[in-house]
């Protein structure tokens, strides 16, 4: 369980400036080599399952909660950054 770094604090901290998280292009998608040794790292659910989850922001998967969190672009808020802040 996340301690004080709750989902909203995560958003506020990380959404103070527009995010530009790199996402693999279509050719790379599905061909990416697994990092590390042995089984390798699991794919980020934000790149597939939750790809379009965040409307006006970027997806960050919170492993402790087994859920996506949206890092909202400036001026937006809410679960999926739907809301334009007045």
């Amino acid at each position: 369980d996340l301690q004080e770094a709750d989902l909203d604090l995560l958003r506020v901290t990380l959404s103070s400036k527009p995010q530009a998280l790199a996402t693999p292009n279509k050719e790379e998608h599905g061909k990416r080599k697994k990092k590390g040794k042995g089984l390798g790292k699991k794919r980020d659910p934000c790149l597939r399952k939750y790809k379009d989850f965040c409307i006006h922001g970027e997806c960050k998967y919170v492993k402790e909660l087994r859920a996506p969190s949206c890092i909202c672009h400036p001026g937006y808020h809410g679960e999926r950054c739907h809301g334009l802040s007045l």
């Epitope: 369980d1 709750d6 989902l7 909203d8 659910p45 399952k49 939750y50 379009d52 989850f53 409307i55 006006h56 919170v62 909660l65 087994r66 859920a67 996506p68 809410g78 679960e79 999926r80 739907h82 809301g83 334009l84």
Partner: antibody, heavy 118, light 113 residues
Framework: EVQLQQSGPELVKPGASVKISCKAS????????MHWVKQSPEKRLEWIGE????????TYNQKFKAKATLTVDKSSSTAYMQLKSLTSEDSAVYYC???????????WGQGTLVTVSA | DIVMTQSPSSLSVSAGDKVTMSCKSS????????????LAWYQQKPWQPPKLLIY???TRESGVPDRFTGSGSGTDFTLTISSVQAEDLAVYYC?????????FGTGTKLEIK
């Protein structure tokens, strides 16, 4: 399996308040916001608002800001909605709902019928 | 608020018929950043909560029969049932899934002759 279990039907008098509950199971309660939707007798659906179960932070539909109050009890994984100053216009079925990986409301409670009558 | 207008309000068809229903939004539901339309369709059978059928205007939710097809972009959307079955008797709602407050259409009631 994600489940949202709502409290039973309520018969309340005009001017009174009512508090309905939605108990979540099958997922991490604090990982997803809880939403509430009203369905009037004419079957019209209206989004009331949402609450972040971790922080208690809410976003309301302006229309329901003075009518509904959303709260949660993390210890029991239960979301609540209180409706105040009830009138016949508030007679409806109220649903709690949760988004899925696709975004829209994938998981719904069974609904709570609230009837306002003298 | 975004207003969702559905038509027709009701339809009476025979099993096996093809059905189309319309949903128009007062503002575009297309996100220019990712070129996705944030429009959902729900089916509500009597005495049940709504069930998600289509999201992103055209993507079927897992387990939804392929006779249900969503199409459209921007402000004009369509739900098509290629061959209506008796169990499709329900009210169908579209939903603005793009911005607060979320808004639903008034619904199209599908009746089977």
């Amino acid at each position: 399996e994600v489940q949202l279990q709502q409290s039973g039907p309520e018969l309340v008098k005009p001017g009174a308040s009512v508090k309905i509950s939605c108990k979540a199971s099958g997922y991490s309660f604090t990982g997803y916001y809880m939403h509430w939707v009203k369905q009037s007798p004419e079957k019209r659906l209206e989004w009331i608002g949402e609450i972040n179960p971790r922080t208690g932070i809410t976003t309301y539909n302006q229309k329901f800001k003075a009518k509904a109050t959303l709260t949660v009890d993390k210890s029991s994984s239960t979301a609540y909605m209180q409706l105040k100053s009830l009138t016949s216009e508030d007679s409806a079925v109220y649903y709690c709902a949760r988004v899925g990986s696709s975004g829209p409301f994938t998981y719904w409670g069974q609904g709570t019928l609230v009837t306002v009558s003298a | 608020d975004i207003v969702m207008t559905q038509s027709p309000s009701s339809l009476s068809v025979s099993a096996g018929d093809k059905v189309t229903m319309s949903c128009k939004s007062s503002q575009s539901l297309l996100n220019s950043r990712n070129q996705k339309n944030y429009l959902a369709w729900y089916q509500q059978k009597p005495w049940q909560p709504p069930k998600l059928l289509i999201y992103g205007a055209s993507t079927r939710e897992s387990g939804v029969p392929d006779r249900f097809t969503g199409s459209g972009s921007g402000t004009d959307f369509t739900l098509t049932i290629s061959s209506v079955q008796a169990e499709d008797l329900a009210v169908y709602y579209c939903q603005n899934d793009y911005s607060y407050p979320f808004t639903f259409g008034t619904g199209t009631k599908l009746e089977i002759k």
